[in-house]
């Protein structure tokens, strides 16, 4: 027999434990996850609990903002003696549970982080069936998530229409980095057309290349900037080019 | 629909290099990490390297660390597999395949290539 | 790392149902939910058939389910059919370095 008793915060304690000690409740996680945007993080969590060979159903839960009130960010149910955890939950389809909550591992992934990401997480565990219980970390875990300079993922010139050229640029970074084009013919920098952003990559297309010679893509945020050039050469009397 | 056509593959000397490409199409190229994969004739598969969504992160397997590099051209829809210093032990059927997640490390493939056979033999 | 240890072969007649085992280790099966299975039929490239232990993409028949206990992932086919008859993978994400391996591979043949 276990008593317990709720603390302040509605976690419930183990107090007395008589026949075999049992372990109490407790959390583990790191006080702090740094991490790039784009990339992805592991938010570890771990426990103990005083329910020595609990095989009967359970939630993982995870929340952002603050413990026991903010949105739910991630929530799995896994059914008696098994160990799948059936995602009921997942924000945006970018949270997948790393751990495995029969062995007290309530690791969390997230995908594709975002500066919005950054903020601190708090995991929790409930026991649905004969041990009724439920424990949640108080402190959570802040995720830090860092900007990104830029970085040109890929420049490249295309057959256009018409025996024409046109210029691809494709570049990453967080905040989204602003592009433009510079090249041999005036005004080139104001015809490039910015692309669709898709996730942290931003492509922007310069349509028409009307003269030979570099043609420069430049990347910007508050990062900071990069570079990178392409060149046109035709073989005039026969469409090409040397890039 | 969804596919992924793979090119570059053949003979080649012991201690040459070669180029294999994967070009997707039907699906968002940059939504999910990238793999190959390869198959010696008669044996098993064996993960041969994976790079996530914006080529933020990479692995290799030990076998091929060192010696081959992957890289993805996300405008294109295109992956690539560099091999250099190619030996007889990487003779293969080599597939390139989709990964479900942006992240290739917690990965499934679900497309397959139709495969590209490299023989390496003097 | 040692690939995943799979049965060399395993047979069943029409309508039978078979299950074949994956056995790895405390770093990888055990560790994980991140089991996936793999079909391939001669001269054709694999297909995914369960990715998670027990998820089953669009378009593979519910007669494949996978289930998993301690560090042995399960595959069952049911109501065993001709075109079952294939080579299975397993494959699982591993906490060492590179991140994957794949198992030996299990030859299904429908009597």
């Known amino acids: 027999l276990v008593k317990t008793r709720r603390d302040a915060s509605g976690d419930l304690l183990n107090t007395e434990a008589h026949s075999a000690p049992a372990q109490r409740w407790s959390m583990q996680v790191p006080a702090e996850v740094n991490a790039e945007a784009g990339d992805a993080a592991v938010l570890p969590c771990t426990f103990t609990h005083p329910h020595r060979h609990y095989d009967g159903p359970l939630t993982a839960i995870w929340r952002s903002g603050e413990p026991y009130a903010g949105p739910q960010v991630f929530r799995c149910t896994a059914a008696p003696g098994s160990e799948l955890c059936q995602t009921a939950l997942s924000l945006h389809g970018r949270f997948r549970l790393l751990g495995n909550p029969r062995r007290n591992d309530l690791s969390l992934r997230v995908e594709r982080l975002a500066l919005a990401d950054s903020g601190r997480y708090f995991c929790r565990v409930e026991f649905t069936g004969d041990a009724h219980d439920r424990y949640e970390s108080r402190h959570g875990v802040r995720l830090r998530v860092t900007a990104a300079a830029p970085r040109i993922v890929n420049i490249s010139v295309l057959p256009g229409p018409a025996h024409a050229f046109r210029a691809l640029c494709t570049a990453e970074g967080e905040p989204p980095p602003a592009l433009a084009w510079s090249g041999p013919a005036p005004g080139n920098s104001s015809a490039a057309l910015q692309g669709q952003g898709h996730g942290y990559q931003v492509t922007a297309e310069l349509p028409a290349l009307t003269r030979d010679g570099r043609y420069t893509c430049t990347a910007a945020n508050s990062l900071g900037r990069a570079e990178a050039s392409v060149y046109l050469f035709r073989f005039h009397g026969a469409p090409g080019t040397s890039t | 629909q969804v596919q992924l056509v793979q090119s570059g593959g053949g003979l080649v000397q012991p201690g040459r290099s070669l180029r294999l490409s994967c070009a997707a199409s039907?699906?968002?190229?940059?939504?999910?990490?990238m793999h190959w994969v390869r198959q010696a004739p008669g044996k098993g598969l064996e993960w041969v390297s994976g790079?996530?969504?914006?080529?933020?992160?990479?692995g290799y397997a030990d076998s091929v660390k060192g010696r081959f590099t992957i890289s993805r051209d996300n405008a294109k829809n295109s992956l690539y597999l560099q091999m250099n210093s190619l030996r007889a032990e990487d003779t293969a059927l080599y597939y390139c395949?989709?990964?479900?997640?942006?992240?290739?490390?917690?990965?499934?493939?679900?497309?397959w290539g139709q495969g590209t056979m490299v023989t390496v033999s003097s | 790392q040692s690939a995943l240890t799979q049965p060399a072969s395993v047979s069943g007649s029409p309508g039978q149902s078979i299950t074949l085992s994956c056995t790895g280790t405390?770093?990888?099966?055990?560790?994980?939910?991140?089991v996936s299975w793999y079909q391939q039929h001669p001269g054709t490239a694999p297909k995914l058939m369960i990715y998670?232990?027990?998820n089953r993409p669009s378009g593979v028949s519910d007669r494949f389910s996978g289930s998993k206990s301690g560090n042995t992932a399960s595959l069952t086919i049911s109501g065993l059919q001709a075109e079952d008859e294939a080579d299975y993978y397993c494959?699982?994400?591993?906490?060492?370095?590179?991140?994957?391996?794949f198992g030996t591979g299990t030859k299904v043949t429908v009597l």
């Open positions: 395949a989709k990964g479900l997640w942006p992240s290739y490390d917690l990965d499934a493939f679900d497309i």
């Open positions: 039907g699906f968002t190229f940059d939504d999910y990490a």
């Open positions: 790079i996530s969504w914006n080529s933020g992160s990479i």
């Open positions: 405390s770093s990888d099966v055990g560790a994980y939910n991140f």
């Open positions: 998670e232990v027990s």
């Open positions: 494959s699982s994400y591993t906490s060492t370095i590179p991140p994957f391996v």
